[in-house]
């Protein structure tokens, strides 16, 4: 951002002082400030100075300097007073021309900011404002009358209180331009159509205006159609309407239809696309995978989308097990339209049980048939573990079983003590089984996994612990031989499976 | 007549945030510019920076990082925060209306 | 950083007399300069803006001159009220305060 000598936000300089303005930045610097007389400019690389020997009322005003190769825009400004105990104001502009509803600046700025406290804004000759005028001023840029109307156009002067007596500027007239309307405002109904060949159809094309004078038009693939129009006036809008009837469709009526209407202000078109297709259609089809794998517990939704002509005589979400004859709930199906052939239907299914694992199949009926859509839902469960001590091909056996999904890893450890779990201090020995036997393994059930370690002497003062994991989480038990037999211990947080 | 009023703590401790408010009465606080300047005790005045009724600040550039003047034009009040202070802050702390109108004078200390 | 200096720091003199005292600053900072006059415990008063302005409601008496690096505050006949500490600024980079001048009876 370029910097401003003096380093003041705004000076008061008295009628033929010598002022200079020095701005410095990194690159080439400009200033810009009100056109008024007697200022001289000298640039010196990165260094810009604005300078006069005369200093008059006319002068006052802010000037800003820029850096035009700052990629950020970067300004910086400094406001002037030439305070002339004879001219209280410096009017930039004698005609301000803005449309309805905006502020229109009067650039009418005070040269002596003391006076701030007694000035006015007046219409000429001493006529006060009109009624509902609201209006604000700043010493550095003038009135501003907010929210223009047409008719505040008038001619106005600025008012301060100079040693007890009003002074006037010279006038500033305002000119408020009604707001000119923009092209017809259009409608094109329906937005998007279909029809199976030998139905009827119906097309609509309006548009309004504030004015009569417009014209619209429907063309079908650029080429204009010759309807006969509808006019109306209603809600002080003039209305003209373009309806296409056709009693039997065929393929050439196919194709994209544009609603066009244009005047002195230019022109607006919306478009649709009308289908002619054979015969009745209905389309399913899922953004989702249509195999799923949530862990138990948990949600899911599962969704559908279907596009159909004519519309849906009937659709169901059903359940097809394998565990129990329940059917989803109707409350947790959901259905909605995004437009008039599409629609999406959601099945929610909230903390999933065991017993909800299986097939969903979504059903939807028009005249064109029947479709379905079947989902595969299988359910993650975290490893269940238990270990018993047994003799095999008489050989003492510890055997370890454990059930989720997906199938459970399973490791060994034996470690010295007696632990409901072994810790790291402890540990004497780890086996992993790379491939423990599977036990069953159905589909949309556990997977059950076995896994031998066999032991020739049990020690013990120290304890066996089985540890299956898998991605969902992990279970273990804990097997402490005793001199009277075997004893086991599952973990504290065994986990129950609802 | 444009008056101008300091307020504040007169005892801070060292590392806190020293906070000043100035009230201006008899004239709006949106025009012109309004600045803080401090004159420890037997030193030279020290100008802390300034703010302009069309948003520009400009802040003493050995303090800036310290420093924050804020305005509230409903109370036509604007105020000084200066962080991290130490005993070198202590000072008799002024407010002014550009370079003419000056309040009278706030004592802040800085001490444990 | 632009430094001011003033000289003298002390000044004695008495009613009616002629005082001059001087600023200079480290570089050129074109007129924008101006003189406060302080009394203890008060806050300090702007005599003279851009050199050389006199601040309304501010005796005659009190003028300023010069440009660039070297200006003068004269009072052309000392009153007793103006027995004070005089200060200079200058306000062309940011802002900086001259030592003062102490103005004493003799």
């Known amino acids: 951002i370029p910097v401003i000598e003096p380093s003041v936000p705004e000076l008061v300089v008295k009628p033929g002082a010598t002022v200079t303005l020095r701005c410095v930045g990194n690159g080439s610097v400009e200033w810009d400030g009100p056109p008024s007389p007697h200022w001289t400019l000298y640039s010196d690389g990165s260094s810009s100075i604005l300078s006069t020997n005369n200093a008059t009322f006319q002068n006052t005003g802010t000037y800003r300097c820029t850096e035009p190769g700052d990629p950020l825009g970067g300004s910086a400004a400094i406001h002037l007073y030439v305070k002339d105990p004879a001219r209280p104001w410096n009017v930039l502009a004698q005609e301000v021309v803005v449309f309805e509803d905006q502020d229109a600046l009067l650039p009418c700025l005070l040269t002596d900011p003391v006076l701030e406290a007694g000035v006015s804004l007046v219409r000429v000759r001493g006529r006060p404002l009109m009624r509902h005028t609201n209006y604000s001023f700043s010493p550095w840029h003038g009135f501003t009358i907010h929210r223009a109307k047409f008719i505040q156009s008038q001619d106005y002067q600025c008012s301060a209180l100079m040693g007890g007596r009003k002074v006037m500027s010279i006038s500033i007239r305002l000119k408020v331009q009604k707001v000119i309307p923009g092209p017809p405002a259009l409608t094109l109904v329906p937005a998007e159509l279909v029809r199976i060949r030998g139905e009827a159809a119906q097309i609509v094309c309006s548009a309004s205006s504030v004015d009569v004078n417009f014209d619209v038009f429907l063309q079908h693939n650029n080429t204009k159609l010759a309807i006969p129009q509808q006019s109306d006036f209603h809600n002080n809008r003039y209305q003209k309407v373009l309806t296409l009837n056709l009693d039997q469709v065929d393929f050439q009526h196919a194709g994209n239809y544009s609603c066009v209407a244009s005047n002195v202000q230019g022109k607006h078109s919306t478009s649709m696309f009308f289908r002619v297709v054979e015969s009745a259609y209905l389309n399913l089809s899922s953004e989702q995978n249509l195999i799923q794998e949530v862990t138990v517990g948990e949600g899911l939704n599962l969704k559908v989308m279907v596009e159909a002509y004519p519309g849906l005589q009937g659709f169901n979400w059903t359940y097809l097990g394998p565990f129990s004859d329940h059917q989803p709930e109707p409350k947790l199906a959901n259905a909605t339209t995004k437009d008039t052939y599409r629609h999406t239907f959601t099945l929610s299914l909230p903390r999933l049980k065991p017993s909800e694992a299986g097939r969903y199949s979504f059903l939807a009926r028009n005249p064109g048939g029947w479709r379905a859509l079947t989902f595969e839902l299988t359910l993650r469960y975290p490893p269940e573990v238990s270990v018993i001590w047994t003799f095999i091909n008489g050989s003492g056996t510890l055997l370890c079983a454990a059930s989720g999904y997906p199938q459970p890893n399973v490791t060994w450890l034996q470690c010295s003590g007696h632990t409901d779990r072994c810790d790291e201090a402890q540990v004497l020995q780890v086996w992993d089984d790379p491939y423990p036997e599977v036990l069953s393994q159905e589909p949309f059930h556990k997977v059950t996994v076995q896994s031998l370690l066999t032991v020739e002497t049990l020690e013990h003062n120290q304890t066996y612990e089985c540890r299956a994991h898998n991605s969902v989480g992990s279970g273990s038990w804990a097997f402490i031989p005793i001199s009277a037999g075997a004893h086991t211990h599952p973990p504290d947080e065994f986990l129950f499976t609802p | 007549q444009v008056q101008l009023q300091e307020s504040g703590p007169g005892l801070v401790k060292p590392s806190e945030t020293l906070s000043l408010t100035c009230t201006v009465s008899g004239g709006s606080i949106s025009s012109y510019y309004w600045s803080w300047i401090r004159q420890p005790p037997g030193k030279v005045l020290e100008w802390i920076g300034y703010f302009s009724y069309n948003g520009n600040t400009n802040y003493n550039p050995s303090l800036k990082s310290r420093v924050t003047i804020s305005v509230d034009t409903s109370k036509n009040q604007f105020s000084l925060k200066l962080s991290s202070v130490t005993a070198a802050d202590t000072a008799v702390y002024y407010c002014?209306?550009?370079?003419?109108?000056w309040g009278q004078g706030t004592t802040v200390t800085v001490s444990s | 950083d632009i430094q001011m200096t003033q000289s003298p720091s002390t000044l004695s003199a008495s009613v009616g007399d002629r005082v001059t005292i001087t600023c200079r600053a480290s570089q050129s900072i074109s007129d924008w300069l101006a003189w406060y006059l302080q009394k203890p415990g008060k806050a300090p008063k702007l005599l003279i803006y851009k050199a050389s302005s006199l601040e309304s409601g501010v005796p005659s008496r009190f003028s300023g001159s010069g440009s660039g690096t070297a200006f003068t505050l004269t009072i052309s006949s000392l009153q007793p009220d103006d027995f004070a500490t005089y200060y200079c600024?200058?306000?062309?980079?940011?802002?900086?305060f001259g030592q003062g001048t102490k103005v004493e009876i003799k």
């Open positions: 600024q200058q306000y062309n980079s940011h802002w900086t």
């Open positions: 002014t209306r550009g370079m003419d109108v």
